[in-house]
Each structure stands twice: as C-alpha cells, then as structure tokens.
C-alpha cells in the first residue's frame, strides 16, 4: 500500500542532493587548504541528521549545531560582504576581490547554495516531491532555518567595516523581511562593527538618481544608527564598470563616478 505523503507548496529536494553536498564538500576542502582537515562524510552525516526523520515544519537551529561545529571556519572578520536580492553580482565581486567573502564563499554557504532539501517525520527518506514553502506552509523548514542559522553566525563574526550590496532595481531596496533585513542587520555586533556601508546597485543605464536617499535606505540607516553603528551609502551607477575597476583599479577610467 503506497504510504500517504504530505504535499507541500514548495519544490522538493534538489535531485542528487546527498551526492551534490558531498561533492561540493570535497571540492571546497581541496581548494581551501585551511579546511583540508574537514571530513566530508561526517559533514554529510551531520547535515542529514539535521532534517532526516524530522517534521519539516519543526526544524530548529539546534538541529543544525553538529553541522555548524564541523563547518566552523575563520573568515577575516573585516572582509565580509553581505548582499540582498543581488547574489550574482556579489559573487562576481568576491571572485575578483579575492580577499572578501560572502556567506556562499564559506564552506557551509557553498554546500547549500541554490539547493532545497527536506525530510519526513519518522521516516529516513528524503522528500524529492515537495518541501514546505516559507510563506505558504511554514517558516521553520529545513532550508529557511539553515540560512537563518548560518546568516546569524556570519553577521555575528563581522567586524570593523561591513559592506552590503543591495539591489537598486527592487521596489524595496532594503527589505526588512529579507535575510539581511531580518537576521544579519540585527546580529552585527556594535562593539566590533564600526561602519556598515551599503552599495546600491543601479540597473538602468540612464538611471542617475541618488538611491541612497530612498526611504527604505533611510529606514536601514535608522536601524543601524540606533544600534550604534555608523552608516554609509554609495550608489554604484555602473556595476559592470565597478567590477572592472575592482579588477584593474589603476585603469584611467576608474577615477570618475561609477
């Protein structure tokens, strides 16, 4: 008799999820000498242990603690780049500026980037059919809780000047409900972080507006200032040129406004 399976509103676990996580772990530890000591089989076991046989709407940060412990990594705390709704450009940036790091440049972020996963209560099966959607089903699902946990830890580790890349093409440039707005902003440590600098990325070629004056940016400034952290904002009018100048800063065109 086929067993009844809960139907969730979100897409199911990414196909070949165990193999993907294990392969990514092996690749990452080969590329990053400081993580060569990591046993990828243990990492997978800890990852699996966080959600297998558990109700996918009842996942806690505690469930991920064994994985967090195995994936402990020291990133230079003054070289952290946060982002919201503009992941691709943030990743292009850290590929060029190799001494800065997004969450996805760390082992745990790299393992889970763009993947979906969930299990089922009381069975050791991975659910490849559907997983809970954050809005339509529940917020305490395996994927959301994972990103909340790693994002909180990443923000807590930051120091000195923290940069955040924001999407100037969105109606809410700063969104209080994003991971950045709901988790990272509130977990920056004022005793360690002096300044948060927002880089607002423009989408249109002819867009010369000062998006640092946007009401949502003013809201971000207010939240940050109340936390005793200085706030700074910079318009990036031409993201293509920005990346080029980060790559080749001495280029003669890199003195003008970008």
């Amino acid at each position: 008799v086929p067993r009844w399976r809960q139907q969730w509103s979100g897409p199911g676990t990414t196909k070949r999820f165990p193999e993907t996580v294990l392969a990514r772990c092996v690749k990452y530890t080969e590329i990053h000498p400081e993580m060569r000591h990591v046993d990828c089989q243990s990492v997978w076991d800890a990852f699996k242990g966080a959600f297998i046989s558990k109700h996918p709407c009842n996942i806690t940060e505690e469930d991920y603690q064994p994985l967090m412990k195995l994936g402990t990594q020291t990133v230079p705390c003054n070289k952290i780049l946060l982002w919201s709704r503009i992941k691709d450009l943030a990743h292009q940036f850290t590929q060029v500026q190799r001494d800065m790091f997004t969450l996805e440049d760390t082992l745990l972020g790299y393992l889970a980037d763009d993947l979906t996963w969930c299990g089922e209560f009381n069975t050791s099966k991975i659910n490849y059919q559907s997983c809970p959607d954050w809005r339509k089903d529940c917020s305490n699902n395996p994927v959301s809780v994972f990103w909340k946990t790693v994002s909180r830890r990443f923000a807590e580790a930051a120091c000195d000047v923290v940069h955040v890349m924001l999407n100037g093409s969105r109606s809410k440039i700063f969104d209080k409900n994003s991971t950045f707005g709901s988790v990272e902003v509130h977990n920056l440590q004022p005793e360690k972080v002096q300044t948060l600098e927002a880089w607002v990325i423009h989408g249109g070629r002819e867009d010369s507006r000062d998006l640092c004056q946007d009401p949502t940016i003013k809201e971000l400034e207010s939240i940050i200032s109340k936390r005793n952290i200085q706030f700074s904002c910079k318009n990036i009018y031409r993201p293509d040129k920005f990346l080029q100048c980060v790559k080749n800063p001495e280029d003669s065109s890199c003195t003008s406004e970008i």
């Epitope: 003054n78 500026q97 000047v161 002096q194 700074s232 904002c233 280029d251 890199c254």
Partner: nanobody, 126 residues
Framework: EVQLLESGGGLVQAGDSLRLSCVAS????????MAWFRQAPGKEREFVAS??????????ADSVKGRSTISRDNANAKNMLYLQVDRLKVEDTAVYYC?????????????????WGQGTQVTVSS
C-alpha cells in the same frame, strides 16, 4: 609605482588640533583603501584610521576614535588623504605615515598595505 607624501606635522600643544595631509601620485586609484598609521619611538607601527574607496566607510583605532576624522578627496584624479585629530595628547607623539592598499576593504594590519609614505613627525608637548 605609487608615491605618497605626507605633510602637516610639527610641534603642537596638548589639547590643540592638527590636520595631516597626504597626496598620492603615480599609478594610484580611487579604488585603493587609504590609511594613517603611526609609530612612536621604540614602539611598533600602529593603525590610526582608514577610509575605503567610497570615502564613506571609515574605521578608527580606539586610541583616536571620537576625536579624529579621516577623509579623502578623489577629485581630478588627485588622491588626497586627510587626518584631523582634535584634543591632542602627549601620547599622540609619533611619526604619522600615509599608506594605501589595493582593494576596497579596510584593514588594521600593517602587512596588508602595499605603499607607504616617508612619514611626518608630530610632537605633542604638555
């Protein structure tokens, strides 16, 4: 090659203010982070303040935080760096160095800066 030239040092009274300047020339860029360090006699060179490429992301050592302002001017391909220090103390006596590093992140580490000026002497008397 980047050349850095500091100016503005001298003998000042405790409690007074001082403004140091640094001009960067050669193959420099507004996409460099710029910083001030200082070295007192018999001591290690220490971080004072830095400013990122945008001019907005500033960072200060605890020893000068709240009484100093770092700023930069990237206009006309002329990269200028400034440091205003108020309420000077005898402990601020040192040679002040301008430094720059490739990259947009600030750093307190001497080893992360690529180019250095010759320094300008600041002596604070009581």
């Amino acid at each position: 090659e980047v050349q850095l030239l500091e100016s503005g040092g001298g003998l000042v009274q405790a409690g007074d203010s001082l403004r140091l300047s640094c001009v960067a020339s050669g193959r420099t860029s507004s996409f460099y982070t710029m910083a001030w360090f200082r070295q007192a006699p018999g001591k290690e060179r220490e971080f004072v303040a830095s400013v990122g490429w945008s001019g907005g992301s500033t960072l200060y050592a605890d020893s000068v935080k709240g009484r100093s302002t770092i700023s930069r001017d990237n206009a006309n391909a002329k990269n200028m760096l400034y440091l205003q220090v108020d309420r000077l103390k005898v402990e601020d006596t040192a040679v002040y160095y301008c430094a720059t590093r490739r990259g947009v992140s600030s750093s307190r580490l001497v080893s992360e800066y690529d180019y250095w000026g010759q320094g300008t002497q600041v002596t604070v008397s009581s």
